[in-house]
Interface confidence: medium
């Protein structure tokens, strides 16, 4: 851990992070903000990761300083340089890996003082489900599909008309390993669908929760999906 910045006479400044999750294979953001300084050259940002010897990222005197960067983060990190002056120290992490999960420290030095905050970063895979009428199956069947999840999620069906009903007996869920042998495709089928109803397919693991809704009436079928990351706590 690199801390050696005990400059006497400086106060502590407020640094805020938000626990977040990264979608493996995609780009992620480790969020961190601080009390801004008027001079960019006086701001130092250090990102550290518990258990990693080198730095994740360092920004000082208005530019990246990557001589101490750990090999596992080489070429994968960037701060939003134009937003540092307004107190944004967030880190962009490219091509998130499963091994990027862990505790990160956002360490800030400005002319006003120094401060730090930890951030729990989870990694996994999550994707929006799409619910469709399964026209290849018997006629009262819905199919919920989501291309990438990890760890293996739970899948639960619900309906607006039959609130509280347990659909486990009339649904079937399968998990198919994707080609990179980590993430899995989720497919869940719901049988005995009735008309004039809205059905929801809810997929959840410890990182994210996603819902695909389908509204079925005799004259139209409407779909929508949404996804929320879990455990987004500020510290």
């Amino acid at each position: 851990l690199i801390i050696g910045f005990g400059i006497s006479g400086r106060h502590s400044i407020t640094v805020t992070t938000v626990a977040s999750a990264g979608n493996i294979g995609e780009d992620g953001i480790l969020s961190c903000t601080f009390e801004p300084d008027i001079k960019l050259s006086d701001i130092v940002i250090q990102w550290l990761k518990e258990g990693v010897l080198g730095l994740v990222h360092e920004f000082k005197e208005g530019k990246d300083e990557l001589s101490e960067q750990d090999e596992m983060f080489r070429g994968r990190t960037a701060v939003f340089a134009d937003q540092v002056i307004v107190g944004n120290a967030s880190l962009r992490l490219k091509n998130v890996q499963l091994t990027d999960a862990g505790t990160y420290k956002c360490y800030i030095i400005t002319s006003k003082g120094k401060g730090n905050a930890n951030l729990e970063y989870k990694t996994g895979a999550f994707s929006m489900p799409e619910v469709n009428v399964d026209y290849n199956a018997s006629s009262e069947t819905l199919r919920c599909e989501a291309p990438r999840w990890f760890p293996q999620p739970t899948v639960v069906w619900a309906s607006q008309v039959d609130q509280g009903a347990n659909f486990s007996e009339v649904s079937n869920t399968s998990f198919e390993l994707n080609s990179e042998n980590v993430t899995m495709k989720v497919v869940s089928v719901l049988y005995n669908v009735t008309i004039n109803n809205t059905y929801s397919c809810m997929i959840e693991n410890d990182i994210a929760k996603a819902t695909g809704d389908i509204k079925v009436t005799e004259s139209e079928i409407k779909r929508r999906s949404h996804l929320q990351l879990l455990n987004s706590k500020a510290s």
């Epitope: 009428v133 026209y135 005799e218």
Partner: antibody, heavy 117, light 112 residues
Framework: QVQLVQSGAEVKKPGASVKVSCKAS????????MNWVKQAPGQGLEWMGW????????TYADDFKGRVTMTRDTSISTAYMELSRLRSDDTAVYFC??????????WGAGTTVTVSS | DVVMTQSPLSLPVTLGQPASISCRSS???????????LHWYLQRPGQSPRLLIY???NRFSGVPDRFSGSGSGTDFTLKISRVEAEDVGVYFC?????????FGGGTKVEIK
């Protein structure tokens, strides 16, 4: 409003091919299957098959297998039906019809195909 | 394939009077999921077909309540309680229980 707009009438020679288009509007194209139905002059309706607009996978009725090809272009919400090796008994009106669960709830106006030497 | 047989072929009716069309299938239309996928369509002169009744007896949205469907297994009936001028056209029964989906030959309803 929901509608299916089909391409115009065609006159073809025996042995030729015809490709009929069906442009959907007013609803999310990939949420419904698209079917094709043949109606020969003064005759009833004959189901030719359908395409899953979501996956692009077609299913053909046995009587048309080998001569019919159903495709779709989701970017322009359009389904296509191509019939090859045309014969005189292919002279008919061809309808596209949206499948909602168990039935055809929206139909195109039909495309007349005349096969004549 | 399931053969759908309609009768009569032609049905001359008087305005305001009831009308009935029969449809028989060559095999049961009860699906393994216990539903019966028998539907009725009307094709007015020069137009494309439109859905009237789905799953034996369910009136499609916008269809007047003078139209009703009934039946089970292999025997089905479409009834019009009081025929109106706009009801003229060819009525088709259709099944979607078995692939390929098939239609009846049609019943032409005309005003006497």
């Amino acid at each position: 409003q929901v509608q299916l707009v089909q391409s115009g009438a065609e006159v073809k020679k025996p042995g030729a091919s015809v490709k009929v288009s069906c442009k959907a509007s007013g609803y999310p194209f990939t949420t419904y299957g698209m079917n094709w139905v043949k109606q020969a002059p003064g005759q009833g309706l004959e189901w030719m098959g359908w395409i899953d607009t979501y996956s692009g996978v077609p299913t053909y009725a046995d009587d048309f297998k080998g001569r019919v090809t159903m495709t779709r272009d989701t970017s322009i919400s359009t389904a296509y039906m191509e019939l090859s090796r045309l014969r005189s008994d292919d002279t008919a009106v061809y309808f596209c019809a949206r499948r909602s669960f168990w039935y055809f709830d929206v139909w195109g106006a039909g495309t007349t195909v005349t096969v004549s030497s | 394939d399931v053969v759908m047989t309609q009768s009569p072929l032609s049905l001359p009716v008087t305005l305001g009077q009831p009308a009935s069309i029969s449809c028989r299938s060559s095999q049961s239309l009860v699906h393994s999921n216990a539903n019966t996928y028998l539907h009725w369509y009307l094709q007015r002169p020069g137009q494309s077909p439109r859905l009237l009744i789905y799953k034996v007896s369910n009136r499609f949205s916008g269809v007047p309540d003078r139209f009703s469907g009934s039946g089970s297994g292999t025997d089905f009936t479409l009834k019009i309680s009081r025929v109106e001028a706009e009801d003229v056209g060819v009525y088709f029964c259709s099944q979607s229980t078995h692939v390929p989906w098939t239609f009846g030959g049609g019943t032409k309803v005309e005003i006497k």
